[in-house]
């Protein structure tokens, strides 16, 4: 049920910080039904930690990248690792946390005006649109400059929330990331119990909009801890 999904708090317990929604560390991100783990193991907890196996960066969360957990380790065994903060060493853009990119082997802050056409990311066939719209097709390509001239509308592929138009955030959807609506008052959200605890939510929803926070719905106060419903509410 929706309640069981919302309150499962899927946690991978990878090295902190996993942060919140893309571009908004610590923000509450609502889990939609469909948090995907291999073998259908949907609700992992700290007590039941299993590293999330991956083949490429797109299969990891917005604040993670795919790599071997040991330096020079077996390339065949890769898991999702926490992204690297500013000034940390990197080999590619995906290794750096949101708001940063890899330059000369170091994660540096992304200047939003800086042309990022060189960033590699899985995007999809454009079907003639300025902003590539989603396709089941997965391919590595270089983003063209036109993708950064205008902000992405809902459904446009994105790298960061800053790529999306006002009122949208960049959230994971299947094996892509797209611009989705920021949550409005009354919409369901997930309040993660500890900072950095949000796992790989393949169907992320955005964080709560301005002036709203993710709190237990009033009429759910009496409910057990496992069935508390959180919604976006006025501060």
């Amino acid at each position: 049920t929706l309640n069981s999904v919302l309150n499962s708090n899927a946690i991978k317990n990878l090295p902190p910080p996993l942060g919140g929604a893309a571009g908004h560390p610590g923000s509450a991100v609502s889990a939609a039904p469909g948090i995907l783990y291999p073998g259908g193991n949907k609700y992992q907890t700290i007590d039941n930690y299993q590293p999330y196996p991956c083949a490429e960066d797109e299969e990891c969360g917005t604040d993670e990248y795919c790599a071997s957990p040991t330096r020079g380790g077996d390339a065949g065994v890769q898991i999702c690792l926490a992204c690297r903060k500013r000034r940390k060493r990197c080999m590619r853009h995906a290794m750096c946390c949101p708001g940063n990119y890899c330059k000369n082997g170091i994660c540096v802050s992304s200047d939003q005006n800086h042309f990022r056409g060189e960033i590699e990311e899985t995007i999809t066939e454009s079907f003639g649109n300025d902003h590539s719209t989603l396709d089941g097709y997965s391919r590595r390509t270089t983003l063209s400059s036109k993708m950064y001239h205008t902000k992405g509308q809902e459904g446009s592929v994105c790298l960061r929330s800053s790529d999306c138009a006002s009122g949208l955030c960049c959230a994971r959807h299947f094996w892509s990331k797209i611009c989705k609506p920021v949550l409005k008052e009354g919409q369901v959200c997930t309040k993660h119990r500890r900072k950095g605890s949000h796992g790989l939510e393949i169907f992320q929803r955005c964080y709560c909009g301005e002036g709203l926070s993710c709190r237990i719905q009033k009429d759910h106060h009496q409910a057990s801890n496992s069935s508390r419903l959180h919604t976006c509410q006025r501060h």
């Epitope: 469909g34 291999p38 991956c54 299969e59 089941g136 459904g155 094996w175």
Partner: antibody, heavy 118, light 107 residues
Amino acid sequence: EVQLLESGGGLVQPGGSLRLSCAASGFTFSNYGVSWVRQAPGKGLEWVSSISPSGGWTEYADSVKGRFTISRDNSKNTLYLQMNSLRAEDTAVYYCARYGAYFGLDYWGQGTLVTVSS
Amino acid sequence: DIQMTQSPSSLSASVGDRVTITCKASDHIGKFLTWYQQKPGKAPKLLIYAASTLQRGVPSRFSGSGSGTDFTLTISSLQPEDFATYYCQQSYETPLTFGQGTKVEIK
């Protein structure tokens, strides 16, 4: 030409197992997510399971979770559905389908009939 | 789960008629809405994706509209080969869900 061809259906007793296969051709199979969708006789379409292009993650309908396993072998261009602990309500035509734009299912196989009956 | 409700469940129409089928989602799904046509004994065929984009090879008499929760499939001038069952499907989140179908029959 994109083609998906299911096989492995048949008559099985309740509690039994079957393994469905879906052979893909005419496109680069490893670049696409794929799904299984079923249709009980005279009924509508029901999504069963999905798998990502690399096979890195899977997802299942609640009705089959813990009993069915989706997998793929990209070197053989083949999708699989291992079905265990089959029930009468699993009786349906099973289709494999490829994800296309906006994650609609743009190409479907012809289907394979699974009948669960004693 | 997001519920998809189609209406009507069936309709009778004549060749040349304009036919409209509606699909309502129980929650916001943006434009993640696909329409399919299915004929007896055959696999479904994708007609429209992203709520309003016509799939290559599909006749232009088919059109789709809507966004968010309310969607429409329109056949501008019904042809003999269009008598079939039509399904909508959302792919905004899993479980992927289909409408119950609309059967278009000959009057």
